[in-house]
């Protein structure tokens, strides 16, 4: 299926948007809680699932974007559900910093998409 | 207020370009994306693509590339969509709008401005 | 790209009657479906997002339910300025894609 002309932001760009955001930051989004995912079971996908029930808050809506950009690349992207913790909620800034660690984890051992 | 004022009715040739503008106020500019879209007369919304005036980041509509290009000047607000190699397929009323409460929901609207292509 | 199927195209019904639109989308989108009223001559405005979240002012008669590829929007009791056109969007993954329409008429 067709996806966005303009090439996906780089793991290295979401990196750096995530460190933005998070540090010296104790909350984010006023607190608000997101349910916990997987992110090895397809982390953009699984982390825009939860952080896309986050509104009303500018702080996270370039993260918001960039990891639709980069779900929308994946083969039937909107088709998987990721594994949701649904027993689990965790601050929203908890989320984005699991997400800043794995990816950095990706980022560093090379297998970037 | 938020708010988003754009430029006047364009009639165009076939194969010329369009450069449509949508000054913004109300709002700290680099804050948000403006989207564009489009709306043939009597028909449905499409969405051309959005651009981020905080770091000039854009993504397109597949359906628009190679045609469209958008651009963002910090110093007026003011973003800009230009479209080229004009056809009559092309008429329509463009809009440009920012999503402030949910990502990628445009909930303020400029008023459009309609391109008209005729030779 | 998504394809979002909204029907019916058209409905003509009487004042205080319950209007039903429905939008089904070509795969899962989640809750990431936002409705729009449209008048003619008008821009759209937004009414519902993330399925089923009003907007502020507007008013509590519009309501959306629905997730994965289903998803409903309802005006408990048609006023006669609810007579627009109405369109659902995606906004799961890019490119966002928008319903083709309904219009809603006073009998």
């Known amino acids: 299926s067709p996806s966005p002309v303009t090439p996906s932001p780089t793991l290295k760009e979401l990196i750096e948007e995530l460190v933005n955001i998070t540090q010296n930051q104790a909350s984010l989004c006023n607190g608000s809680m997101v349910w916990s995912v997987n992110l090895t079971a397809g982390m953009y996908c699984a982390a825009l699932e939860s952080l896309i029930n986050v509104s009303d808050c500018s702080a996270i809506q370039r993260t918001q974007r960039m990891l639709k950009a980069l779900c929308s690349q994946k083969p039937a992207a909107g088709q998987i559900s990721s594994e949701r913790s649904r027993d689990t909620k965790i601050e929203v800034i908890q989320l984005v910093k699991n997400l800043l660690t794995y990816v950095r984890g990706v980022y560093r051992h090379g297998n970037f998409r | 207020e938020v708010q988003l004022v754009q430029s006047g009715a364009e009639v165009v040739k076939p194969g010329a370009s369009v450069k449509v503008s949508c000054k913004t106020s109300?709002?700290?500019?680099?804050?948000?994306?403006i989207y564009w879209v489009r709306q043939a007369p009597g028909a449905g919304l499409e969405w051309i693509g959005y651009i981020d005036p905080y770091n000039g980041g854009t993504t397109y509509n597949q359906n628009f590339k190679d045609r469209v290009t958008l651009t963002a000047d910090k110093s007026t607000s003011t973003a800009y969509m230009e479209l080229s190699s004009l056809r009559a397929g092309d008429i329509a009323v463009y809009y440009c709008a920012t999503a402030v409460v949910a990502t990628d929901v445009m909930e303020n609207w400029g008023q459009g401005t309609l391109v008209t292509v005729s030779s | 790209e998504i394809v979002l199927t909204q029907s019916p195209a058209s409905l003509s019904l009487s004042q205080e009657e319950r209007v039903t639109i429905t939008c089904k989308a070509s795969?899962?989108?989640?809750?990431?479906v936002a409705w729009f009223q449209q008048k003619p001559g008008q821009a759209p405005k937004a009414l519902i997002y993330l399925a089923s979240n009003r907007y502020t002012g507007v008013p509590s008669r519009f309501s959306g339910s629905g997730s994965g590829t289903d998803f409903t929007l309802t005006i408990s009791s048609l006023e006669p300025e609810d007579v627009a056109d109405y369109f659902c969007l995606q906004h799961w993954n890019y490119p966002l894609t928008f319903g083709a329409g309904t219009k809603v008429e006073l009998k």
């Open positions: 109300g709002y700290s500019f680099t804050d948000y994306p």
């Open positions: 795969q899962n989108v989640r809750n990431a």
